[in-house]
Structure formats: C-alpha cells, structure tokens
Amino acid sequence: HGSEAKVVRSCAETRQVLGARGYSLNLIPPSLISGEHLQVCPQEYTCCSSETEQKLIRDAEVTFRGLVEDSGSFLIHTLAARHRKFNEFFREMLSISQHSLAQLFSHSYGRLYSQHAVIFNSLFSGLRDYYEKSGEGLDDTLADFWAQLLERAFPLLHPQYSFPPDFLLCLTRLTSTADGSLQPFGDSPRRLRLQISRALVAARALVQGLETGRNVVSEALKVPVLEGCRQALMRLIGCPLCRGVPSLMPCRGFCLNVAHGCLSSRGLEPEWGGYLDGLLLLAEKLQGPFSFELAAESIGVKISEGLMHLQENSVKVSAKVFQECGTPHPVQSRSRRAPAPREEASRSWRASAEEERPTTAAGTNLHRLVWELRERLSRVRGFWAGLPVTVCGDSRMAADLSQETAPCWTGVGRGRYMSPVVVGSLNEQLHNPELDTSSPDVPTRRRRLHLRAATARMKAAALGQDLDMHDADEDASGSGGGQQYADDWKAGAVPVVPPARPPRPPRPPRRDGLGVRGGSGSARYNQGRSRNLGS
C-alpha cells in the first residue's frame, strides 16, 4: 500500500477533532499508546481505545449511509415529482374529458342527455377506478355503458312503444352475444375500447412504474451496511484518526475500492437502464400512437358516432331486435309516460365537437411532460454506476482529485495507494482488495425483481398489452383509430441510451415542495464529464 513517510507521536490533532465531535477526551490519550487491542485498525501505536474504535466504526457507517442517501435524494425527488405530475395530468384529463362530453352532449342533445347523464357519469367513474384502483374490469365498464346506452336510446327511436323490463333485458343480451351480429352502435364500441384501453393501460403502467421506481430507490438507499463494509469504512475514514493523522485524507483509489465493494451488491445497476428505457418508451407511446390526450378527447366523439350509427341504421337494428325479442306493446295514449318529443327523437344525434386540444388547468400537456421526463431521466441514468465516485467526492471520504499526487492515507499509513481500482459487476468485485463482496441479499434481489416487473409491465403496455390481465387482449395489437404517427423513424428504434459518458454528479432537489432532503453540500466533485458525444 505504500510506505509511511512521517511517524506521528502526538494525539493532539485527534483529540481536537474528536473533542469537536463530542467524544469524551478521557477516552483519548494525549500521545500514542500500543494498539494491540484494536480490532480493525492496524495494531500499531494508536490514539484509540477499544471504545473509541467501536464508536468510530459506527460514525463511519453513519457518514457513509448519509452520503448515499443524500446522493440519492435527487433521484427519489425526480421520480416522485414525475409521478405526481403524470398522475395529476392523467386524472385531470379524465375530468376534462368528462366535462367536455357533458358540454358537447348538453349542447347537442339537450334534455335527452341530461335525463341520462347518470350512465355517462358512471362510465367515467369506471374509467377512473380502472386507472386509479383496480386495474380490472375495463371491458366490463365499457360493455355496461354501451348496454345501458342502448337500453335508453332504443326506446327513444320508438316512442310509440312501451318496453317492459324483460324486453330491455333481451335487448342488452343481444348486444353482448359472442357473434356480435347486432352491433347497434357499429364499430364505435370496439374502437373506443381499443383507444381507451391502450391509453389507460399505458398511463397506469407509466404512473405505477414511476411509483415503483421511487419506492425501490428509497429502499435501496437505506440499505444496512454489512460487517465487511463497516470494517472497510473504518479503515478508510476512522483509522487515520486512531493513527493520529486526522488531516491525512484517504487515497482516492482506496475510497473507490471501498465504495464499490460496499455498493456493488446493493445497487440496482443491472435493471436500472432497462427500467429507464421502459419509462421512456412508454412515455413516447403515450404522446403518440397510444395518445392519452386523443383517447380522452375521443370518448365523446366515439359515443356520438355510435349514436349516429344507431339512428342511421335504426330500421335494420330494430327489425333484428323485434325478431329476437318480440314486438313490444304500443303505448296507450292515456297512460303514455312522457316520452321524448318526436322532434327530439328524430333530430340528428350528431354531436359537433370543438377542435381545440385540451390542456390542464396548469397549462400542461403530455408533450411537455414527456419532454421533461426525458430531460430528468437523462440525469439519473448513470446514478448507480456513478455512486461510488459521488461518495468518494465528499471531502470526508477521500483526498480531492487535485491532490492526487500528494501522499494520502492508504489504510495502513501515509503513502501512495498502489492497488488497482476495481469497478464493475459483482463478479469483478471478487478481486476487490479492500473487502469480500457478498452476493445480493434477499431484499436487494426483491427490489431488483420489483424493478424488472415494472419494466416488463411498461414494455408490455407499450405494445398495447396489460400484464395485469390474465389473458392478453387479442385486439391489443391492432392499429389505433387512424392516428397519424410515425412510431419511429427506423423500425425497432427505442428511446434509449444517449452516448456513453461518465455519470453526472447528483443534483440538488428542486424546490417545489416535495419535502425531500437536500443533497450534501459537496455534490459537485465528479470527474469532468467527457462530452465527445459519439454518433
């Protein structure tokens, strides 16, 4: 590890540093004593009693854990803020859609709509429940809606008849037959279902993916420090104090080996890149072929088209219905329950939609949100790979980059750290000279699996499939309702990895009231990022 160039005899510097930290000076001798009692530091002359050594071991762990958590606070904040923004957006888009449908239908259908508004409200409740809660029953919600709509609309086409409950039951049964031969609303139910389900599945998967990421990262940053790591951290930042040289900073290579060894089995590195790619791919689809905005906007239009189809094909539809369900009784003129006036029933059931594209109250649109997501995620791609560099950039952990040629603490004394820095995977960490690296523990493996599951759900949603549903929807891969969107300029392109470059330093959290702890003050010691962006 290099040689000690200068022997220190006094413990004055150590007493001063530890005294300022609140250590009892009674435990620290004024000059070096024999170190045979030491368990971690070299058993040479020392300023540490056994008790002081144990306390320093705990301090080293607290320092390291604090640095890891502070470095990751930006990451947690990024995912939390994106989750909040997308979730607010999707929920608000559903509300806007419900409101604009109410306006459109009130304007176009008047009393006809207001009398039956409950079924439209129930449709939106079902869509909201699907997005926010269960992730189930979307097909049922839509099928129920169209059945109820037919139940209300069909009698309006025939105000001269009275329709008993068993007739209406037969009517709804007809619409749900497997052969789909009746199709009173034409292709509108299928098209609406396809557009809505794709968009809602994608929106749910994205928001859940962001939430899973945030939770997994929060847990991963709070990992317990294992014994081998605890001892290595003590050798790194505690033992200089015991040696009487607290101002001698640990060698950078020494710190990097300790940090890599402590973190390699704890991070999310194998899954992290794929997870970010999943988020970006899905976000791209949500503003393109699975557009949530278009889907939300189109609900009213598709329903209106369905009603138009029913009206235009009423003769054919009615003939089939009467053939299957029997002819209802004519209404007695005396007992006529105020039907919709003939002119309301016979006027065109066409709703004229405004062309204006909606934005939320905050003026947000999906385009902007996806742009922001890309910008933010580009900052966190190299987080786990760069975490050791980030940790060792703190002034408590290692000598500054500018001091690299100066002697430093090697783990046994003052000198040059000669061991190679071992970066990379868990397998490569087997050659780490500073600690024996364990394989990932059960909680870490579980976190990685959570991340992998979220990634799989997002990638499936980007293909129009819902992994929460047992059997994949055979319609899911069909083309959307004619949206003009170039999926990618070249087949199979995925919005993934920008050109390789060293990881960035962690970011201070943004001040938008998410209550995440700020990063440590020393957040900007990263090696200069190479910006020769290969093409």
Epitope: G288, Y485, W489, L533
Partner: antibody, heavy 119, light 107 residues
Framework: QLQLQESGPGLVKPSETLSLTCTVS??????????WSWIRQPPGKGLEWIGS???????YYNPSLKSRVTISVDTSKNQFSLKLSSVTAADTAVYYC???????????WGQGTLVTVSS | DIQMTQSPSSLSASIGDRVTITCQAS??????LNWYQQKPGKAPKLLIY???NLETGVPSRFSGSGSGTDFTFTISSLQPEDVATYYC?????????FGQGTKLEIK
C-alpha cells in the same frame, strides 16, 4: 466527428415561406435520444430557440412561433429542415441548426446562414 | 416561459482582470443551465454545462456556479481572445430560453 451545415435561400419575400435544410455528416440523424434543433439570431440581437424534433418524430416548438413553424426530418438524406411561413422583416436572422441530447447542451452547431426577409 | 436575465448587458475589463457575469432565472431551474461564448460571425461555443461543469477543452480560467435561480459565470484572468458575447441558456422547461447576452470588451 459530427458536423452540421445549413443551406437555403438567403433572401425571402415577406409573406412567403422560409425553407432551410440542415445536412448532418459524420453520424446518423436517426440515432436514438437526439433532438435536432433550430435556433436563430436577428442581427445584433440575442439567440432564440425556434424548435426541435426528437428522433422519434415528436416536435417541440417555441410558442411564440408555433403557428408558423414546421420542423421535419428526411432520414434517407440525413437532413432535417425548417419551414417558417408568413415571414416578415422581423424574421431576418442568422439561422443555426444544432443537435441536443436529452439533458445536455446544444452541441455541435452549424456555422449559421443569414436569411433576409425583404421585397 | 422562463425568462433569463443577464447582467451586465456589456462590460469592459482589462487583461488579467477577474470578470463576472450573472444570470437570473424567473423561476427555479435547478442547475439546468449552460453558458456559451459567441465571437462575431461565428456560432456559439459551449463553455459550461449544468451550471458548473467545464466543457472538455475549455481553459480552466472559465468557471460557473449557482443553482435554483441565480447563476454566475466567471473568467478568473481575462485574456485578449475572450472578447465575445456570452449567453446563458436554460433547458429546465419548454420553451428553451437564452439570456439576452453580455458583450465583453477589453479596456
């Protein structure tokens, strides 16, 4: 090394459409995660971002110009282009094309081309 | 839109002087800020990215600092070739916006 080169007419009449092309050499325009952007600078004034097109086809425009701007890509020619309709003298500027990666600066830039709007 | 206000709009300094330019954002932009140098008749050149990181190949006399809304660009010892206009640029939010520029001259 990636290089960008703007081309197009140096003089456009008022109310007409300004059309510029940026040719990318030394790299593929369809590489993932790139934004291809247009920025302009009126004589003696500051820089104004016009808009960008992401490799997936999503376009982002400055709201102040949005109603008049179209940015598109021709992968077969490794080019992207700018169209600005209904131009006035206020659109006289040096027009630059540039590349951006998400979360990064504009780099590299083309050398710029002066477009004058005058009858 | 996020407004970027640079000050001063022009300044004159002597060779060897320490020069400071400030840039203020109308809202918190974290450190989503870059600094460019533009010489007459040339395209802008990137000097500092992410508020404080020196671009590869840029002399170390250039530096940047700040986060949130207030940012500073510094030339520690002015050289004759530093005569140019300097721009800050935010990319925290759309639309991307630039400061109005600071024209630097030699006394």
């Amino acid at each position: 090394q990636l290089q960008l080169q703007e081309s197009g007419p140096g003089l456009v009449k008022p109310s007409e459409t300004l059309s510029l092309t940026c040719t990318v050499s030394g790299g593929s325009i369809s590489s993932s995660s790139y934004y291809w952007s247009w920025i302009r600078q009126p004589p003696g004034k500051g820089l104004e971002w016009i808009g960008s097109i992401y490799y997936s086809g999503s376009t982002y425009y400055n709201p102040s110009l949005k109603s008049r701007v179209t940015i598109s890509v021709d992968t077969s020619k490794n080019q992207f282009s700018l169209k600005l309709s209904s131009v006035t003298a206020a659109d006289t500027a040096v027009y630059y094309c540039a590349r951006r990666v998400s979360g990064h600066p504009f780099d590299p830039w083309g050398q710029g081309t002066l477009v004058t709007v005058s009858s | 839109d996020i407004q970027m206000t640079q000050s001063p709009s022009s300044l004159s300094a002597s060779i060897g002087d320490r020069v400071t330019i400030t840039c203020q954002a109308s809202q918190d932009i974290s450190d989503y800020l870059n600094w460019y140098q533009q010489k007459p008749g040339k395209a802008p050149k990137l000097l500092i990215y992410d508020a404080s990181n020196l671009e590869t190949g840029v002399p170390s006399r250039f530096s940047g600092s700040g986060s949130g809304t207030d940012f500073t660009f510094t030339i520690s010892s002015l050289q004759p070739e530093d005569v140019a206009t300097y721009y800050c640029q935010q990319y925290d939010n759309l639309p991307i916006t630039f400061g109005q520029g600071t024209k630097l001259e030699i006394k």
